[in-house]
């Protein structure tokens, strides 16, 4: 029973985690304009992996996609790749883990096969979670580096032909969503790996014992017993959780820097 619960919980936690990774990847608020030293601008800038947005205090939001592939920073490309790999691995892991669930009977699938599938999905979830955490962390590191560079620019003065107010970016909501989601996927994967140990059939062959009866020499060999901690077909209602990722940018919403939010 404990194995089924661990496996089921691992699946649900991973599912929530992967939904979060998808949501984070799609979100536009990976980096948001730092308002600490510049709270008086009536324009709020924020950026995602796929587009950058500007929200005016009048409520109008304009988002522009990054329509170039070669012109983008290598780090951004790397973050995109990590997040996509995380999503793909997570999705495959979910698919595998559905068939591996103890509460689902598919033909005459043996426990050993289910154990292997559970382990496979668990590893996939762990790698998926690590990819997401790595992607978000790389982006966060990039932000920190740029933040201090732009802070230095603020005080040393900016040369060049185009005069612009130095916009510094700080951590956006997507980073926190990504970290939490990656962590959940990782935890889910670990839980699946733990469940796999309980599902794996252990061959316990008892040594043959010879009984010498008077007059006859009879060797009695009891058959090898398969020790399994698994319980029979535990038919429970299977809930499919739909983790929908939504972005909030086309809605006329107002940035947090104003006192009229």
């Amino acid at each position: 029973m404990a194995v089924t619960a661990c496996q089921g919980l691992g699946f649900v936690v991973s599912l929530i985690g992967i939904a979060g990774i998808i949501a984070a990847t799609c979100m536009d608020q990976w980096s948001t304009q730092d308002l600490y030293n510049n709270p008086v601008t009536a324009v709020f800038n924020y950026q995602g992996l796929w587009r950058s947005c500007v929200r005016e205090s009048s409520g109008f939001t304009e988002c522009r996609g990054y329509f170039t592939l070669l012109g983008l920073p290598a780090m951004l490309q790397a973050v995109r790749a990590l997040m996509i790999v995380g999503i793909v691995l997570g999705a495959i892991g979910l698919l595998v883990s559905i068939f591996a669930l103890k509460c689902i009977r598919i033909g005459s699938m043996e426990d050993s096969a289910k154990a292997n599938m559970t382990l496979t999905s668990g590893i996939m979830f762990i790698v998926s979670g690590l990819c997401a955490i790595a992607g978000v962390s790389v982006f966060a590191n990039m932000l920190v580096t740029n933040f201090w560079m732009s802070t230095a620019n603020m005080y040393t003065g900016m040369g060049g032909m185009v005069q612009t107010v130095q916009t510094r970016y700080t951590f956006g909501a997507a980073l926190f969503v990504g970290w939490v989601a990656g962590g959940l996927t990782l935890i889910g994967g670990v839980m699946m790996c733990i469940a796999c140990r309980g599902l794996a059939p252990e061959e316990t062959n008892y040594k043959a014992v010879s009984y010498h009866a008077s007059g006859h020499s009879v060797a009695y060999k009891p058959g090898g017993f398969k020790a399994s901690t698994g319980f029979g077909s535990n038919t429970k209602n299977k809930k499919i959780y739909d983790g929908g990722a939504r972005t909030e940018d086309e809605v006329q919403s107002y940035p947090s820097k104003h006192d009229y939010v």
Epitope: V40, A42, S52, V54, S57, G59, Q163, V165
Partner: antibody, heavy 117, light 113 residues
Amino acid sequence: VQLQQSGAELVRPGTSVKVSCKASRYAFTNYLIEWVKQRPGQGLEWIGMINPGSGGTHYNEKFKVKATLTADKSSSTAYMQLSSLTSDDSAVYFCARGGFGNSFAYWGQGTLVTVSA
Amino acid sequence: DILLTQSPLSLTVTAGEKVTMSCKSSQSLLNGGNLKNYLTWYQQKPGQPPKLLTYWASTRESGVPVRFTGSGSGTDFTLTISSVQAEDLAVYYCQNGYFYPYTFGGGTKLEIK
């Protein structure tokens, strides 16, 4: 888009006045209402803005004590109350609807407030 | 507060002439996020409320005649009227839409000979 403002007001110093701005032919809660002051023969001064959807406001520090902005969604009307009036408050007050680029896209006809003893 | 300085204070021109007026900001109004300049131009005719001409420094509002053109970036902006008409008699104001509080220039009064 139409913004219809209340009529001219002649008020005593030290009293207060409430100017109204009725919006029509657009979704009132979707756009900010901005308020602007223009003294006779002079330039324009931004007073503040209100988000009619949430009731949230943002003021020019200079007018934070002087003006209070409110909005009534049911009647699609924005209000500006001016308190402790002095002769310096004698001006034409405009309401305007926010637009792209934080511009003021549509304007009311203006309300003349005269503060006189 | 951002200071917007308009020049000249007044202009007297003949109908059909080309007119240029300037607006200088004490700080850059260019937003790095979308590379747009948050400067707006208005026309105010006597006894009327101001009318929006251009926003984002150069985007003409719908219904505004093509003879009105806004240009410039950063701190220096210009409004050009390619061929002045008699109905263009008005005061022209520029407005900062980037920093709070929003501020207006002192205005340029256009008079027709």
